[in-house]
């Protein structure tokens, strides 16, 4: 029977800069029941606070709701593991909410084959930003990536789309079914998960090249 091993705060993420969650990995438990607590203070303050919500983010997590989240302050946090034989502390982690945003995937992905009379046909891909993100405030710049592949192909083809919420692909294999997905990230943050795939059947008379 031993004191607990050193825990590690390994990830903090925010869906929209308004709330965030941090997760830790327990160290060894020393063969005894172990309690974990996360404490934090804001940079420039000495007053320590305990995690406001251990439930929302699941096991070994701390969730900071709106009233506890400030974009303009750095949070300094650590996890304390305690059992009957003693305690151990994680390293301090410095968290700036601006840099941990991982949005939900974009919404309303629509894919359409366009065949204008006077120009080459193309695949038109369109989507909307995730609902939790308020782009009107100017706090966010969302960047997008599209990926597509023929249904039976092994490798995806990825395209960086910048800020635009639409994309055109000209050359595709006629008669094939393509999968298309989109994801987003803020300019200082993490890529969202890929959106659910949308399937599109390319007509067999689709002109392959430009």
């Amino acid at each position: 029977q031993l004191p607990p091993g050193k825990p590690e705060i390994f990830k903090c993420r925010s869906p929209n800069k308004e709330t965030f969650t941090c997760w830790w990995r327990p160290g060894t438990d020393g063969g005894l029941p172990t309690n974990y607590s996360l404490t934090y203070h804001r940079e420039g303050e000495t007053l320590m606070h305990e995690c406001p919500d251990y439930i929302t983010g699941g096991p070994n997590s701390c969730h900071f709701g709106k009233q506890y989240t400030s974009m303009w302050r750095t949070y300094i946090m650590m996890v304390n593991a305690t059992n009957q034989m003693g305690s151990s502390f994680s390293d301090e982690l410095y968290v700036d909410v601006t840099y941990i945003v991982q949005p939900d995937p974009p919404l309303e992905l629509a894919v359409e084959v366009k065949q204008p009379e006077d120009r080459k046909p193309y695949l038109w891909i369109k989507w909307s930003p995730p609902t939790l993100i308020d782009l009107k405030t100017g706090w966010f710049t969302l960047l997008y990536e599209i990926r597509l592949k023929p249904e039976k192909a092994a490798e995806w083809e990825i395209h960086f789309a910048g800020q635009q919420t639409e994309f055109k692909i000209l050359s595709l294999h006629p008669g094939q079914k393509y999968l298309v997905q989109v994801r987003c990230k803020p300019d200082h943050g993490y890529w969202s998960a890929w959106s659910p795939a949308t399937f599109i059947q390319i007509p067999s008379d689709f002109t392959m090249n430009d």
Partner: antibody
């Protein structure tokens, strides 16, 4: 017929400024991304900057960030590159290039030479 | 440091097949971003030769082909001709740089 014509190059002292232009004709200018790519004498190609169709989104190579500004005027079918605080290592032929679906550079201008020397 | 590595030179005799490689990393080619190839004939502006890994623009002969696997891409030229003597560049977007990367270029000589 697609035509791209760069202008504005020339001889400039270190620390000086130049504004390059790229006049486009023969297609709908506003429908495309646009790039600037440069090539130092006897060297390879180096991407400098690109700008999205909506003008609000731009990217720059680290070597020019904070010194160069890309812009476009869709009403004049013209792409620009404002180059400030020029250095000897900015000496190159500067090409404008049109960006199609994967922002591939499908048409290039003939280039304009920028020489930075004291 | 993100780079696309190409051999500085390649050569072949007329009629031969030549391959030029372009090796990247997990932040560009290996990430899944597409690769484009450009041909620059002596004294001229670059020209798009292959786009999105393996597509040919109209007007480019089918002697030119592209492929991509993992963190590398290749340009193959079959039935080599004297007019193929040029510099060849690969290019791909890079996620960590948030910018385009060009390979260093390969000078192809037709012997």
């Amino acid at each position: 017929e697609v035509q791209l014509l760069e202008s504005g190059g020339g001889l400039v002292q270190p620390g000086g400024s130049l504004r390059l232009s790229c006049a486009a004709s023969g297609f709908t200018f506003s429908s495309y991304w646009w790039h600037w790519v440069r090539q130092a004498p006897g060297k390879g190609l180096e991407w400098v900057s690109d700008i999205a169709r909506a003008s609000s989104y731009t990217n720059y190579a680290d070597s020019v960030k904070g010194r160069f500004t890309i812009s476009r005027d869709n009403s004049k079918n013209t792409l620009y590159l404002q180059m400030n605080s020029l250095r000897a290592e900015d000496t190159a032929v500067y090409y404008c290039a049109r960006g199609l679906d994967a922002r591939r550079m499908d048409y290039w201008g003939q280039g304009t030479l920028v020489t930075v020397t004291s | 440091q993100s780079v696309l590595t190409q051999p500085p030179s390649a050569s072949g005799t007329p009629g031969q097949r030549v391959t030029i490689s372009c090796t990247g990393s997990s932040s560009n080619i290996g990430y899944g971003y597409v690769v484009h190839w450009y041909q620059q004939l002596p004294g001229t502006a670059p020209k798009l030769l292959i786009y999105r890994n393996n597509w040919r623009p109209s007007g480019v002969p089918d002697r030119f082909s592209g492929s991509k696997s993992g963190t590398s891409a290749s340009l193959a030229i079959s039935g080599l001709r004297s007019e193929d003597e040029a510099d060849y560049y690969c290019a791909a977007w890079d996620d960590s740089l948030n910018g385009w990367l060009f390979g260093g270029g390969t000078k192809l000589t037709v012997l």
